[in-house]
């Protein structure tokens, strides 16, 4: 299953399959997730080691047993690949690293005014994988405000150096934020020229394209079909690049198919997995296991559940079958692709779905209405769980926020439904940033059921929590995916990086905002919070957040929205915006419903009809 925990001061011994330099453990974990054989990783931050060559070292590891011995190493961070972790699987990495220079091939230099602009330039440049920016205080005046766009053979820095007044980061193309746009066309009977960066075997051009999309240096590809004249080249997928970023020439060629990486697509990227099953095809590879199962779909499920399995063949040969069950061959290879593809067989083959974002139907659950004061604009895909709850009576208006916690579930505040309990009047918009983008043609979700906490009473601050079951399940994308829930009774975790988001008022007597606002707010202990509210009881089922001096807070219209905290690289829904004394007032923290205290209730209410929980807490 999905293992998200990180091990501090621990290093996995042995099992190395690859190594690289990464700026932090989270990026190392992402590289492990997308590496075909990596199950475990260990990362050495700069502070953990004197050897300059090993600083920022990211070591990707495999193990037949799924685990490796851990040795104590001060400062090291180790963990698991996020294969099988559904919506947590993403190649998108937004962080900016201050005081760090990520080295690579510098192919473009320009002057820009901010690191954000530099990241934008990288994202809008087809060859840029990462960048470094020299700030206005950089020691050499001639380099100040320089934005260096970079690439490397593996897509990761060739070295990482600690350097003051330099900021580095990665292209946001994997976040589906590129302005370049992409070519969706597949060109039949056409071969592209230029440099081959890799060669794999695939059953069709679509798998070839997805592999190209997630390969760090592939910009376009040519696929040779299974009837290509040279037998040894059949089903070969050639991943290609060029200096210009486009093919320098193309040749008409029977039984070839060419196309482009979809990494530069805006708003939608293909899933990093291949779900199609290929009848009459055998995939060859290293044998992992053989098991008897009933049907090819069960074979695929078995492969997906066995984390090391990359692809499978389900044999229908009489000698491979007993009663209704036949042999399911679970296989793997060095590069994640079959080592041989045979046609006209009595088998059916396909790939593990361990890297599919959608996962199953489960979710990672690892007094005045309130909005965002003192916040800043959010960007696309930054808070993909944020939804807008709107009411359509004569006019349509945004009333509350909410958090997507499953394909069919939204968590919000009970008080949002005070006086409006009718599900038909509500419209739920997900995957949006600007309210002004909503037109009559914008898709929305309707409510199947509103579940208000049984102990909630109108106009009281207690048990201010409600679940919304949507009429139809939502697909997950980079812009629309769930937030992890905390573990039940999560009291030991000290959260230091917490954010509140919403379209609510930007001042006490204000108006709904167009662009989703975000604000970084520190948590306040319940004891401190209680002192600030002389007449309201701050219970253990509440969590408070705010600045002593005020100025930043949630406000009217943010109610029901998320208070999320990042811990060990993972966002968790810590609170639901509930109430406060005015907005952003001095010494008056915002009060949020503490989600961890309601985990039993959430899990009970989200049980599906077959009794299978649709939410899971991380182990």
């Amino acid at each position: 299953g999905c293992l998200t925990q990180l091990y501090e001061n621990a290093f996995f011994r042995g099992g190395d399959v690859a190594s690289m330099y990464t700026p932090n453990a989270q990026y190392c974990q992402m590289r492990c997730t997308f590496h075909p054989r990596c199950l475990l990783f260990s990362f050495l931050p700069a502070s953990s080691i004197n050897d300059m060559e090993k600083r920022f070292g990211c070591f990707l590891k495999d193990s037949v047993t799924g685990t490796l011995p851990k040795v104590h190493r001060t400062g090291a961070v180790s963990g698991h690949s996020l294969k099988q972790c559904g919506h947590q699987i993403s190649a998108c990495h937004r962080d900016i690293y201050k005081g760090v220079d990520m080295r690579g091939v510098n192919f473009n230099v320009s002057k820009v005014s901010s690191v954000e602009e530099c990241q934008k330039r990288c994202t809008s440049n087809i060859r840029c994988q990462f960048f470094s920016y020299a700030t206005q205080t950089f020691h050499k005046a001639e380099y100040r405000n320089n934005c260096l766009l970079k690439y490397s053979p593996g897509g990761t820095p060739t070295a990482i150096k600690v350097l003051s007044n330099v900021e580095s980061g990665f292209s946001l193309k994997p976040c589906a934020l590129s302005e370049i746009g992409c070519h969706m066309n597949i060109f039949q009977h056409l071969a592209f020229s230029d440099v081959d960066v890799a060669r794999v075997l695939t059953p069709d051009a679509f798998v070839c394209r997805t592999i190209c999309t997630y390969h760090p240096n592939c910009l376009f590809f040519t696929f040779y079909t299974n009837v290509w004249k040279i037998e040894s080249q059949r089903n070969v997928c050639l991943l290609k690049t060029s200096e210009s970023g486009t093919p320098s020439s193309s040749t008409p060629q029977e039984n070839t198919i060419s196309g482009y990486s979809l990494l530069t697509c805006k708003r939608t990227l293909p899933e990093p997995c291949h779900s199609k099953i290929y009848p009459g095809v055998d995939f060859g590879g290293e044998e992992l296991n053989v098991t008897f199962v009933k049907g090819v779909n069960v074979c695929q499920e078995t492969c997906t559940k066995m984390i090391r399995c990359q692809f499978f063949t389900y044999s229908l040969l009489p000698e491979d079958c007993k009663e209704e069950k036949c042999k399911c061959f679970l296989r793997l290879s060095m590069d994640g692709s079959p080592t041989r593809i045979a046609y006209g067989t009595q088998g059916s083959s396909g790939y593990s779905l361990r890297l599919c974002n959608t996962g199953d139907n489960s979710v990672c659950t690892t007094k005045t209405s309130t909005r965002i004061v003192g916040g800043t604009n959010s960007s696309w895909g930054e808070w993909p769980w944020q939804v807008s709850l709107q009411v359509k009576l004569t006019a349509q208006r945004h009333l509350c926020g909410g958090s997507l916690i499953g394909h069919q579930w939204v968590l919000t505040a009970a008080h949002c439904f005070d006086g409006l309990p009718l599900q038909d009047v509500w419209r739920i918009y997900s995957g949006i940033l600007n309210l002004s983008d909503i037109t009559k043609d914008t898709p929305f979700s309707q409510i199947k059921e509103i579940i208000i906490h049984q102990n909630y009473k109108v106009s009281e601050g207690n048990h201010d929590i409600a679940l919304i079951k949507l009429q139809a399940p939502l697909n997950y994308t980079e812009f629309q995916k769930p937030i992890c829930l905390p573990s039940k009774g999560d009291t030991s975790t000290i959260y230091t990086n917490c954010w509140v988001t919403g379209w609510g008022f930007s001042k006490e007597k204000g108006e709904i905002q167009n662009i989703l606002q975000k604000v970084n707010i520190p948590l306040v202990t319940n004891e401190e919070c209680q002192k600030r509210y002389q007449d309201y009881k701050i219970t253990q089922r509440m969590v408070c957040a705010g600045y002593k001096e005020g100025g930043k807070d949630a406000c009217k219209g943010d109610s029901g929205g998320p208070l999320v905290c990042k811990h060990n690289g993972m966002w968790r829904l810590v609170g639901i915006t509930s109430w406060g004394e005015g907005c952003a007032r001095r010494e008056q923290p915002g009060v949020y419903t503490k989600v961890a205290e309601y985990m039993d209730w959430i899990l009970e209410k989200t049980q599906s009809s077959d009794g299978k929980a649709q939410m899971q807490s991380p182990a």
Epitope: N462, Q530, K531, R532, Y533, Q534, D535, K537, I538, E587
Partner: antibody, heavy 116, light 106 residues
Framework: EVQLHQSGAELVKPGASVRLSCTAS????????IFWVKQRPEQGLEWIGR????????KFDPKIQGKATLTADTSSNTAYLQLGSLTSEDSAIYYC?????????WGQGTLVSVSA | DIQMTQSPSSLSASLGGKVTITCKAS??????IAWYQHKPGSGPRLLIH???TLQSDIPSRFSGSGSGRDYSFSISNLEPEDIATYYC????????FGGGTKLEIK
Amino acid sequence: EVQLHQSGAELVKPGASVRLSCTASGFNIKDTYIFWVKQRPEQGLEWIGRIDPENDNTKFDPKIQGKATLTADTSSNTAYLQLGSLTSEDSAIYYCAKGGGLFAYWGQGTLVSVSA
Amino acid sequence: DIQMTQSPSSLSASLGGKVTITCKASHDINKYIAWYQHKPGSGPRLLIHFTSTLQSDIPSRFSGSGSGRDYSFSISNLEPEDIATYYCLQYDNLFTFGGGTKLEIK
């Protein structure tokens, strides 16, 4: 309207115990804290303790510990203060109050006289 | 535990005048001080919390200030109904009242 109604005056003998009641109206005691405060004749106010009626959690002034017991009955929306082993030092007006971080609303007080 | 020293213990002032009461805490109480008005036969009434925040129904003639260990409370434009005993209360660490100040009108 928020109101706290306290039981009537009590005349008790030294060594005995007494139970004072504080009945709330206009709000649910589960949604607040109930505090108790003592005022001896011609003297100032002293905090005794507080109860969270939702879970019966209590907090006391360390000097009072053992003398007072706080309870609550959410079905009747009433909080109680029980005082044991009474001496003349316990002769006072006892107030109940509701609130969160502070005593925001007060009852009218109950006079307890300890006399042989 | 925190002690609160309130002074004066009594004072007399003229109608329309101004009075100031002070409270000194034995430790820094981080502005967590409240002021109450107490008249015989009823429970005390909360006037100010968090040093200077007036309760919603309290006239602006009442004010509070201070920080650290030293706090003060003032009533300006004195009216007959202001005759009462006034208490400070620290609520930074549990609760401690000051000794009280009895206000009389000359």
